[in-house]
Interface confidence: medium
């Protein structure tokens, strides 16, 4: 007769491992007992269990409650056992020793491999600001057995670097994603992808990029100076900028306080019916946590009467 087993049994952490051992004997041969032991190199054999033809399954105290026979129906020549709830420490060499009559003893070894699926974590780097050089955007760490694979999925241009730390029964892999921050990256997804034989599908953790910036400020509303004349209603100045985080706006007048009746509404400065008092230099001050910008414009409110007088003068002068 001969023993049938597997060279390697692979199981995911927490699952049950079937340790196969089947005696393919000649007719009339009987199995007296099947002894299972852990036989890692450099250590003495540690008994798991014994399948006895008379006593049935007897489990070593060290493995009490963790070793069972596979569910029926069972072949009397089958010495396979189930190791319940495999843990990382179970990884190693196991030996099945079959005592048969009249053929004698047979033994076979197998290796139990316990896959420890990783639990990845993503850590964002320092705050990203436009104008920085190459900066850490995020790092992704996954520890498992065997070592997991850590990659990045993104449309953002950047560079990656990985390092691995080996522990006694597992390995931790850390991958870093570096980029040169620009405002176009704002809101873009950066996804860490972890692959491992113990995972049914890749694990993905997505980080949304936030790049701090503040665009130059500009003021709209003075495109047609002729519209800024005494008596005009609804005149307004609008401050244009954009940023991350969204900026706040503040209006001041350089050559004095804001005239009465002028309304500040965020990025907009609204005027009452225009008078010459509204002429002056107005400053839009834009700021966020990252930076601040100023833009100033000169408002010159025209007096239509003066203008018509001048025209007459000009005509008469000609």
């Amino acid at each position: 007769g001969e023993l049938e087993t597997s060279d390697v049994v692979t199981v995911v952490l927490g699952q049950d491992a079937k340790l196969p051992c089947f005696y393919r004997g000649d007719s009339g041969e009987q199995v007296g007992q099947v002894a299972w032991a852990r036989v890692d190199a450099g250590e003495g054999a540690q008994e798991l269990a014994l399948l006895h033809s008379k006593y049935g399954l007897h489990v070593s105290p060290a493995y009490e409650g963790r070793v069972e026979q596979p569910p029926p129906p069972r072949n009397p020549l089958d010495g396979s056992v189930l190791l319940r709830n495999a843990v990382q420490a179970d990884e190693g060499e196991y030996e099945c020793r079959v005592s048969t009559f009249p053929a004698g003893s047979f033994q076979a070894r197998l290796r139990l491999r316990v896959l420890v699926p990783p639990l990845p974590s993503l850590n964002p780097g320092p705050a990203l600001e436009e104008g920085q050089g190459l900066t850490l955007a995020a790092s992704c760490t996954a520890e498992g057995s065997p070592a997991p694979s850590v990659t990045w999925d993104t449309e953002v241009k950047g560079t990656t670097s990985s390092r691995s730390f080996k522990h006694s029964r597992s390995a931790a892999v850390t991958s870093e994603f570096h980029l040169v921050p620009s405002r176009s990256m704002n809101g873009q997804p950066l996804t860490c992808v972890v692959s491992h034989p113990g995972l049914l599908q890749d694990q993905r953790i997505t980080h949304i990029l936030h790049v701090s910036f503040l665009a130059e400020a500009s003021v709209r509303g003075l495109e047609d100076q002729n519209l800024w004349h005494i008596g005009r209603e609804g005149a307004m100045l609008k401050c244009l900028s954009e940023g991350q985080p969204p900026p706040s706006y503040n209006w001041t007048r350089l050559d004095g306080p804001l005239p009465s009746g002028v309304r500040v509404d965020g990025d907009t400065l609204g005027f009452p019916p225009l008078t010459t008092e509204h002429s002056g230099i107005y400053v839009c001050h834009v700021s966020n946590e990252f930076s601040s910008r100023d833009s100033q414009v000169t408002v010159d409110v025209l007096d239509p009467q003066e203008d018509s007088g001048k025209q007459v003068d000009l005509v008469s002068a000609s």
């Epitope: 014994l50 008379k54 105290p61």
Partner: antibody, heavy 119, light 107 residues
């Protein structure tokens, strides 16, 4: 039929030595855990020593540690107990017994051999 | 080492009586407990293993129970051939240890 036959007992003076043997037949001796158990006259059972199938695991009772040595020869289907520095309190019937492993019951016993330590 | 304490050390009973022998372990041994019967001048014979499993060929009037530290051997209806000494033994760890024995005598 399983048979365990002890031999080697006898009268010995305190401080002397004896070697007990246990010849096994009717089962695959090389697969079984073997033990020596003794019983002093009119007293209870005391496990003396045990040895695993491949001699990889050996245990002794505190009362004999350092004086007794258990061994086996699987090619001869024989278990041994070398007893040195014998004392009067070692006087007993010595049984050999087999079990599938140390955590299984002692299912087969020999008839025993009497060791008497006396001056 | 694990100490095994058996009680009583002896008892007198009549044929047909129900007899109970207890065995206490000095620490938790789960169900790694065996019971043996020994008659005068004879070799010990295994009665019960794993605390409650009857060895094949042993009459069903013998039963065992318990787990952890406290165990019981019960003979439901004592027969003439049951007068003997009974020993408990733990197989949880080496050194293997026996109880002191309980001698069951005829009243």
């Amino acid at each position: 039929e399983v048979q365990l036959v002890e031999s080697g007992g006898g009268l010995v003076q305190p401080g002397g030595s004896l070697r007990l043997s246990c010849a096994a037949s009717g089962f695959t001796f090389s697969d079984y855990y073997m033990s020596w158990i003794r019983q002093a006259p009119g007293k209870g059972l005391e496990w003396v020593s045990g040895i695993s199938w491949n001699s990889g695991s050996i245990g002794y009772a505190d009362s004999v540690k350092g004086r007794f040595t258990i061994s086996r020869d699987n090619s001869k289907n024989t278990l041994y107990l070398q007893m040195n520095s014998l004392r009067a309190e070692d006087t007993a019937v010595y049984y050999c017994a087999s079990s599938g492993s140390w955590y299984l019951p002692l299912d087969y016993w020999g008839q025993g051999t009497l060791v008497t330590v006396s001056s | 080492d694990i100490q095994m304490t058996q009680s009583p050390s002896s008892l007198s009973a009549s044929v047909g009586d129900r007899v109970t022998i207890t065995c206490q372990a000095s620490q938790d041994i789960s169900n790694y407990l065996n019971w043996y019967q020994q008659k005068p001048g004879k070799v010990p014979k295994l009665l019960i293993y794993a605390a409650s499993t009857l060895q094949s060929g042993v009459p069903s009037r013998f039963s065992g129970s318990g787990s952890g530290t406290d165990f019981t051997l019960t003979i439901s209806s004592l027969q003439p051939e049951d007068f003997a000494t009974y020993y408990c033994q733990q197989s949880y760890s080496t050194p293997l240890t026996f109880g002191g024995g309980t001698k069951v005598e005829i009243k």
